[in-house]
Interface confidence: medium
Amino acid sequence: IPTEIPTSALVKETLALLSTHRTLLIANETLRIPVPVHKNHQLCTEEIFQGIGTLESQTVQGGTVERLFKNLSLIKKYIDGQKKKCGEERRRVNQFLDYLQEFLGVMNTEWIIES
Amino acid sequence: IPTEIPTSALVKETLALLSTHRTLLIANETLRIPVPVHKNHQLCTEEIFQGIGTLESQTVQGGTVERLFKNLSLIKKYIDGQKKKCGEERRRVNQFLDYLQEFLGVMNTEWIIES
């Protein structure tokens, strides 16, 4: 994905810009956007970026707020690229089981699970 | 989702069953399954469960290996439920920005990012 800066730096910069422009972004008090009700963020990337689109369409553009939305679109491109890589390589069952075990291990230790 | 045990316990039990049945599951040496090439597992749940389906259709069923696939199907139901909760509640921009900031924060600290 053609970004001038590495994705990790892009994320950091975007966090800073989000903080800078918060007052401008919350100016529309009637706007309602779907917000996930759990913290397993990666499951909700589609809805998050739809929300960003809604917000962008309601925000007066100009200056560094444009940079914020540009950055967010590059982050989306990065995530879309990662999603493409989910099914690109066919491997032996052994390697699939390693990945499945890793996935369940992460779910076991890192996910916020409400029963 | 009607499971007799909490999801967290279900995940633990499934990890154990996966380990128990590994030899049986890898018996088919010609089978190839798509394996994600990165560690952001939550982005790849669809492909992971498609892979499990491929594996199940090639595995001789019976005994506790059936329990493994049953468990995995309950985990899928849980994740599908979580995905539904991504867009269910409409909130103020303020709350959306909190979630977006949290998402980017997690991406910044926990994601495995290759540029």
Partner: nanobody, 122 residues
Framework: QVQLVESGGGSVQAGGSLRLSCVAS????????MAWFRQAPGKEREEVAG???????SYADPVKGRFTISKDNAQNTMYLQMNSLKPEDTAMYSC????????????????EGQGTQVTVSS
């Protein structure tokens, strides 16, 4: 202990009908993909009809339009309604099941009944 027991076979004239039943014990039909197989003397065993865990139904070409597979989850029974029977339908018919939670393809059947004989005379 899983058991599949077939019944309903018998002798019938060409053009007649039979209804085969397969009662399952030790498993619930909600959790399984099922199929009817048949084997005629000196011939390959073939899958006649199948019903997946998600209710998708498939038929072998020679029986399409004549045979109907169904299941009654409450009775834990699968059926095969056979109409317009032909002499070439003569075979031992058996039912088979496998618990599948993800895949609808029935590559491996774990459980199978003893079978019921169907004889069609011309």
């Amino acid at each position: 202990q899983v058991q599949l027991v077939e019944s309903g076979g018998g002798s019938v004239q060409a053009g007649g009908s039979l209804r085969l039943s397969c009662v399952a014990s030790g498993l619930t039909l909600n959790d399984v993909s099922m199929a009817w197989f048949r084997q005629a003397p000196g011939k390959e065993r073939e899958e006649v009809a199948g019903i997946d865990i998600d209710g998708l139904i498939s038929y072998a070409d020679p029986v399409k339009g004549r045979f109907t597979i169904s299941k009654d989850n409450a009775q834990n029974t699968m059926y095969l309604q056979m109409n317009s029977l032909k002499p070439e339908d003569t075979a031992m018919y058996s039912c088979a099941a496998v618990r599948l939670y993800f895949s609808s393809s029935r590559n491996q059947y774990k459980y199978e009944g003893q079978g019921t004989q169907v004889t069609v005379s011309s």
